[in-house]
Interface confidence: low
């Protein structure tokens, strides 16, 4: 059995007697230290039980320089095997060995969990020579131990290319429970079960877990770590934490808020960024997401016009970016715009509605009843039309654009004329005789030029040949 040296143990008396922590198994290794030695360990631990078999590596020297006398096997003396202490305490432990004086330049190194301890560690090696042997004590001290100091420590010494290894000294640093997994904040659906996990470790073990909801314990009996708490469902926000208990005391995890998912708050600050004749670019500031990510948003558009049927156009868009270009709108129209966004729970209320207007656009219909005839006496072409019939104007009519194309013997020439908005007739000079003139007319607003009417053709004869018959396009419904 391993003797546990607890921190309450009294320091082992150094003098007189054998080396501290040594195990006396044969009489050849007995050695008394000189009483004048200034060596005084800060904390020593009681020796292991006599008679314990030695399991470390042993170096067996062959002969002395004289070649006659056999030397005993070299081995570290047994020392305390297991040290248990609390975090932030100081500890000092050692290993010792008696080495015949024929060996020179012996060095002892310390190893922890298979790795050599180098650098800024408090390791001291002291030598106590006698007639035939030198007692070597290697001490290792740690101030304010931490959990990371837990592990198995050994001494190693090299002699004649042989390696001598001591028994391990197990350091166990005990303290309050240490969380390896704490509960995490969650957003959950109302009245839906969910799990929280808490895990803590010692030493010392075992670690027991209590769950706390809104400052009240959930479980009367503790659960061994790790613990999973299944919450059947919540109707309102709650704060959970877990308490981890061991023999040293208790540690409390961070409190985590469990939020209940709800529909989002409505967006705010709907703003107009750009208007054209048929589109409006808007942006908005999303409302609170109700503890559930936004999925998409809906832009709702109502035409503010006594003549409109009051229907709402709905445009669905992604939740991000918080921007949308509303298209396919009427020119020179007023609209009321609202935005609503949804998460997995449902749709928010609509944002405060804002007013926006589209700018003037080009007309959407062409002039009607385009009639063309030749006034040969004046050598010009007379054109007549009707104002485009439309339920609503795309903008204020500023005039008409007349396209007349003259085709003769493979040559084609297009000319454009502009006339004012009050005109419904125009005259254009004959450009070429013995040719075809094709006329089209479009309405014009500040927003642009509308579509051209269907082409009307008239043949312009050579001089002296008259045809007074007009050419025309019929009005809609009269064809």
């Amino acid at each position: 059995a391993i003797t546990e040296a607890r921190e309450e143990a009294k320091p082992y008396p150094l003098f007189p007697g054998p080396l501290p922590g040594s195990l006396q198994t044969d009489h050849t290794s007995l050695l008394s230290l000189p009483h004048t030695s200034g060596y005084q360990p800060a904390l020593m631990f009681s020796p292991t039980q006599p008679g314990r078999p030695y399991t470390g590596n042993v170096a067996i020297p062959r002969v002395t320089s004289a070649g006659s006398k056999l030397l005993p096997p070299l081995a570290f003396k047994h020392t305390v095997g297991h040290i248990i202490l609390s975090e932030h305490k100081d500890v000092k432990f050692n290993c010792s060995i008696s080495v015949p004086n024929i060996y020179q330049d012996t060095t002892i190194s310390w190893w922890k969990d298979g790795k050599e301890l180098l650098g800024a560690h408090h390791a001291i090696t002291q030598f106590y020579p006698d007639d035939e042997v030198t007692a070597i004590i290697a001490s290792f001290s740690i101030t304010s131990v931490q959990r990371s100091d837990n592990g198995s420590y050994i001494c190693k010494m090299k002699i004649n290319n042989e390696e001598i290894v001591s028994d391990p000294i197990y350091i166990e640093v005990q303290g309050l429970p240490h969380f390896t997994k704490q509960p995490e904040s969650m957003n959950v659906t109302r009245n839906t079960a969910f799990n929280l996990t808490c895990q803590a470790v010692g030493p010392p073990e075992p670690v027991n877990i209590f769950w706390v909801q809104n400052s009240s314990r959930v479980n009367e009996q503790p659960e061994k770590s790790p613990s999973v708490l299944t919450v059947p469902g919540l109707t309102e926000m709650a704060v959970f934490s877990c308490e981890a208990h061991n023999d040293k005391g208790l540690t409390v995890s961070k409190g985590v808020q469990i939020n209940i998912k709800a529909i989002p708050s409505p967006p705010t600050e709907v703003s107009i960024h750009n208007s054209t004749a048929h589109s409006i670019l808007i942006s908005w500031v999303p409302g609170f997401d109700g503890y559930s990510p936004f999925r998409n948003c809906s832009v709702q558009v109502k035409e503010v016009d006594p003549l409109s049927n009051g229907s709402v156009m709905i445009f669905n868009t992604s939740a991000s970016p918080h921007m949308y270009q509303i298209k396919q709108l009427q020119a020179l129209a007023n609209y009321s715009i609202g935005v609503s966004c949804m998460n997995e729970i449902g749709w928010s209320a609509v944002s405060p509605w804002i007013l926006a207007s589209t700018t003037e656009g080009a007309p959407s219909v062409a002039p009607l009843n385009v009639t063309v005839f030749l006034n040969e006496s004046r050598d010009n072409v007379d054109i007549r039309w009707m104002k485009p019939l439309t339920k609503r104007q795309a903008g204020e009519l500023v005039g008409y654009r007349i396209s007349h194309v003259w085709q003769s013997a493979g040559i084609s020439k297009e000319l454009l004329e502009e006339v004012g908005q009050n005109n419904s007739r125009a005259q254009i000079s004959v450009q070429v005789h013995n040719a075809t003139c094709t006329v089209r007319i479009a309405a014009v607003t500040k927003g642009g030029v509308g579509p051209f009417s269907d082409p009307v053709k008239i043949f312009i004869p050579a001089h002296g040949w008259v045809d007074h018959a007009p050419s025309s396009t019929p009005a809609p419904g009269n064809a």
């Epitope: 703003s271 107009i272 960024h273 750009n274 970016p321 918080h322």
Partner: antibody, heavy 121, light 107 residues
């Protein structure tokens, strides 16, 4: 650390085309919501917004100057460019480029030091 | 275009005083207004955005408010380093427009 630096010709003659470059560091125009704009400041007229380009290559111009302005970017080189065609003496000003981060709100949080332009025959 | 009017061209104040710089928008712009400070020989720096939110690193003696389309930048306990030009800007719609600026002089 976000920095912007404007560069330009300094002096131009009327009817020439002004080419400005904004070189920036500390952010990328590949990032969602990022944008860079141009603003000019003339001694008599205060600050005037000229144009803005967004991460997704959306461009917006001041309508009063739109026919003369062209904004563009080279994302890989962290540069934004502005061209103003057919300059005249009223274009004499200090030209700033500035950054908008995150889309909304649309305010310029970092500005360059400005590059002066004098248009003179 | 939305016109931002800063009627006070120059304001004179003393260290420790409280002063209000005003800006009026010609149309509704919501809270989409930012205030910039421009010290002599420097480029503008954002002070207050969305009408009342201080930009990071701006001392809390700078505050912003609005009433309808009237926007106010208030500097309480004026310091000598506050000598600068102050501009408002709306970003409710394109084109973004600036006020003409108010120059703060320290007596």
């Amino acid at each position: 650390q976000v920095t912007l630096r404007e560069s330009g010709p300094g002096i131009l003659q009327p009817s020439q085309t002004l080419s400005l470059t904004c070189s920036f560091s500390g952010f990328s125009l590949n990032t969602f919501g990022m944008g860079v704009g141009w603003i000019r400041q003339s001694s008599g007229k205060g600050l005037k917004w000229l144009a803005h380009i967004w991460w997704d290559d959306d461009k917006f111009y001041n309508p009063a100057l739109k026919s003369r302005l062209t904004i563009s970017k080279d994302t890989s080189k962290n540069q934004v460019f502005l061209k103003i065609a057919n300059v005249d003496t009223t274009d004499t000003a200090t030209y700033y480029c500035a950054r908008i981060e995150g889309g909304l709100p649309y305010y310029y949080d970092y500005w360059g030091q400005g590059t002066p332009l004098i248009v003179s025959s | 275009d939305i016109v931002m009017t800063q009627s006070q061209k120059i304001m004179s104040t003393s260290v420790g005083d409280r002063i209000s710089v005003t800006c009026k928008a010609s149309q509704i712009v919501g809270t989409n207004v930012v205030w910039y400070q421009q010290k002599p020989g420097q480029s503008p720096k954002a002070l207050i955005y969305s009408t009342s939110y201080r930009y990071s690193g701006v001392p809390d003696r700078f505050t912003g408010s609005r009433s309808g389309t009237d926007f106010t930048l208030t500097i309480s306990n004026v310091q000598s380093e506050d000598l600068a030009n102050y501009f408002c800007q709306q970003y409710n719609s394109y084109p973004f427009t600036f006020g003409s600026g108010t120059k703060l002089e320290i007596k």
